[in-house]
């Protein structure tokens, strides 16, 4: 039969410039001598010869004089190859081919890697920065391999995904320089971190920059928003109220108004230098232009969706700046529950029945309560499941398992905790024997 040749299943990871050992072994039979051995290492794809041993002699490297065998270990079946001063171009599959009487071969993968340098950060512009200014932050990391993954996040660790452009260029040695550019609208201040990950080494290199915009000697702008969340029904329009107190002589040319998502800093809507810059949020936002000069910076959000739920920051900059966050709580009423009974005929006292209460397209998740005809809560043997659809709206199904008495009414109440809206349905089971639904 064929000769069994063993190599590692996982790729051999080697740092650029270091030496790597591509392990390969076979089991020599008793009485084996090296004169019987033919050993060939070759590139799997191109069949290019890398190193060979034949007729009892090391035939040497055919691969830039950077390979060597372990001659003292060959007789014990160690056919491993030493590859020196690893380069990016070495990456790939190497086949170890062993022939004595029979022959066998196996391929081992070499994965080359090089760590990325600590990123350097540049900020443009880097002076006279004000809230509302757009800045470009460039994160550069050098001489890594393979291509990096780049992540941006703010000071709270929240990922920043919008307006990121990353480019990677290989040099003559095949090592990559990575440049990632984040374009961001400045808030009151902020820390921006760039993380460059080598996916093979699982090595993270990171740097951050903290930007504190210029403040005016005349003091901050006071920005007012409602303390309580704004509750909006799915599909309707919502007004996120925000106001400031304009000074005498204030003109809109002086105003920088920015609405952004509090967590991700994603721009929602802006007004700068006397002009409404429009919606950056699916064209569903609008300001109240006629009211801006009086200090009304409120935002109209149209056709509210579940995904809109969260905190929005209203950022006002005139001479100085101020900001405040308003929460949007999205809600949708639940439909009147439909009730089903199983089994629904030939029912007798003592039978166990399953009553299902279903209510649809509500938000947020519902609270479900069961009670009997006297209003006594039924808590045992209730299973409630809620599933969100593509729009994020929930369908709720609650199952009550109950042993029938002589007769009884079972009510299901589906409560929307935000709207404090209760939708209920009930089923009355009477008679003996009973059928459901009652026959006309």
């Amino acid at each position: 039969g064929a000769l069994e040749v063993q190599v590692p299943e996982d790729p051999v990871v080697a740092l650029v410039g270091t030496d790597a050992t591509l392990c390969c072994s076979f089991s020599p039979e008793p009485g084996f001598s090296l004169a019987q051995l033919n050993l060939i290492w070759q590139l799997t794809d191109t069949k290019q010869l890398v190193h060979s041993f034949a007729e009892g002699q090391d035939q040497g490297s055919a691969y830039a004089n950077r390979t060597a065998l372990f001659p003292d270990l060959l007789a014990q079946g160690n056919a491993s190859l030493r590859l020196q001063r690893v380069r990016v171009a070495d990456e790939g599959s190497f086949t170890c081919f062993v022939s004595i009487r029979d022959f066998g071969s196996a391929a081992v993968s070499l994965q080359v890697a090089a760590p990325y340098s600590k990123p350097s950060m540049t900020l443009e512009p880097n002076k006279d920065l004000r809230p509302g200014d757009t800045v470009t932050i460039t994160c550069s990391s050098y001489q890594g391999y393979p291509e990096a993954e780049v992540f941006w996040q703010d000071g709270q660790g929240v990922p920043l995904t919008g307006n990121v452009t990353t480019s990677q260029m290989a040099n003559e040695q095949g090592l990559f320089d990575v440049h990632s550019i984040l374009r961001v609208v400045l808030g009151a201040n902020g820390t921006y971190s760039c993380l460059v990950r080598n996916p093979v080494l699982q090595q993270d290199a990171h740097s951050s920059v903290t930007i504190t915009p210029q403040r005016s000697p005349t003091g901050a702008v006071e920005v007012q928003v409602p303390e309580d969340p704004v509750v909006a029904l799915v599909g309707t329009d919502a007004t996120l109220r925000c106001s400031f107190s304009p000074e005498p002589g204030f003109s809109l040319a002086q105003l920088n108004l920015i609405w952004q998502l509090t967590d991700t800093k994603q721009l929602v809507h802006s007004f700068t230098e006397g002009r409404d810059q429009g919606s950056a949020y699916a064209n569903r936002t609008a300001l109240f232009p006629d009211l801006l000069a009086q200090g009304n910076a409120s935002l109209r959000l149209q056709r509210v969706r579940v995904a809109d739920e969260g905190s929005f920051t209203c950022f006002v900059s005139i001479r100085d700046f101020g900001s405040a966050a308003v929460s949007l709580q999205v809600a949708a009423p639940y439909s009147k529950p439909s009730m089903t009974l199983e089994p629904n005929k030939d029912l007798r006292p003592g039978d166990t029945v399953t009553i299902t209460c279903s209510s649809y397209r509500g938000y947020p998740e519902a609270e479900v309560f069961w009670q009997d005809g006297q209003g006594v809560p039924l808590t045992g043997n209730v299973t409630t499941s809620q599933m969100a659809n593509e729009q994020g709206l929930f369908d709720v199904h609650s199952v009550l398992r109950v042993v029938l008495g002589a007769n009884g009414t079972y009510s299901c109440l589906v409560r929307n905790p935000v709207l404090q809206q209760d939708a209920h349905g009930s089923v009355t089971i009477t008679g003996q024997p009973m059928t459901f639904p009652p026959e006309a």
């Epitope: 443009e124 512009p125 002076k127 006279d128 004000r130 200014d133 757009t134 800045v135 470009t136 460039t138 550019i181 374009r183 210029q214 005016s216 000697p217 005349t218 002589g249 003109s251 040319a253 002086q254 230098e273 006397g274 001479r319």
Partner: antibody, heavy 116, light 107 residues
């Protein structure tokens, strides 16, 4: 090193148009607005307008809205200003300058002479 | 538009003199004023921004002050290379507007 290099001097006939270029190097072109400023001998500097190379958003001085058109070519990091319907009062040195509030780097200036 | 009034329009001074140039604005611009220096045949060069912040590489003999509507540029000890024209510019509003310049000449 940041540099703004403008195209050479132009002599034009009244009624014609001229396109002045400003090639930027040494910084991220899309990170700074590019402004254009007019200077006539013995007169005040006049701000013509500016363009954001990132998305080509423009802001014009109303006095130049029908005179100047600002564009950019991101691939070559070059900003352009085209002046149309030239008249003798358009004879001036035109500068490009980068920035929003502060103009920290300026081109060397392009002299446009309008003469019949 | 915000009007910029610079004075004097020209002045003669000697090396070592203390020179003060004034810029007034038609409305409150807080501190958003910059000063530029221009030599004949050259483009303007930024000296000071935010009324009093010295641009990198600009000698400390240049000093800006003021806020609101009244600003000054002071050269504490005039040097031969300082003979030039100086402009103020407001950055509070669009359009940006410039003063018409103060020419500092050798006495």
């Amino acid at each position: 090193e940041v540099q703004l290099v403008q195209s050479g001097a132009e002599v034009k006939k009244p009624g014609s148009s001229v396109k002045v270029s400003c090639k930027a190097s040494g910084y991220t072109f899309t990170a700074y607005w590019m402004n254009w400023v007019k200077q006539r001998p013995g007169q005040c500097l006049e701000w013509i307008g500016r363009i954001d190379p990132y998305d080509s958003e423009t802001r014009y001085n109303q006095n130049f809205r029908d005179k100047a058109r600002l564009t950019v070519d991101k691939s070559s990091s070059t900003a352009y200003m085209e002046l149309s319907s030239l008249r003798s009062e358009d004879t001036a040195v035109y500068y490009c300058a980068r920035g929003v509030r502060i103009f920290d780097y300026w081109g060397q200036g392009t002299t446009v002479t309008v003469s019949s | 538009d915000i009007q910029m009034t610079q004075s004097p329009s020209s002045l003669s001074a000697s090396v070592g003199d203390r020179v003060t140039i004034t810029c007034r604005t038609s409305e409150n611009i807080d501190y958003t004023l910059a000063w530029y220096q221009q030599k004949p045949g050259k483009s303007p060069k930024l000296l000071i921004y935010n009324a009093n912040t010295l641009e990198e590489g600009v000698p400390s003999r240049f000093r800006g002050s003021g806020s609101g509507t009244h600003f000054t540029l002071t050269i504490s000890s005039l040097q031969p290379e300082d003979f030039a024209t100086y402009f103020c510019k407001q950055a509070y509003d669009v359009p940006r507007t410039f003063g018409c310049g103060t020419k500092v000449e050798i006495k």
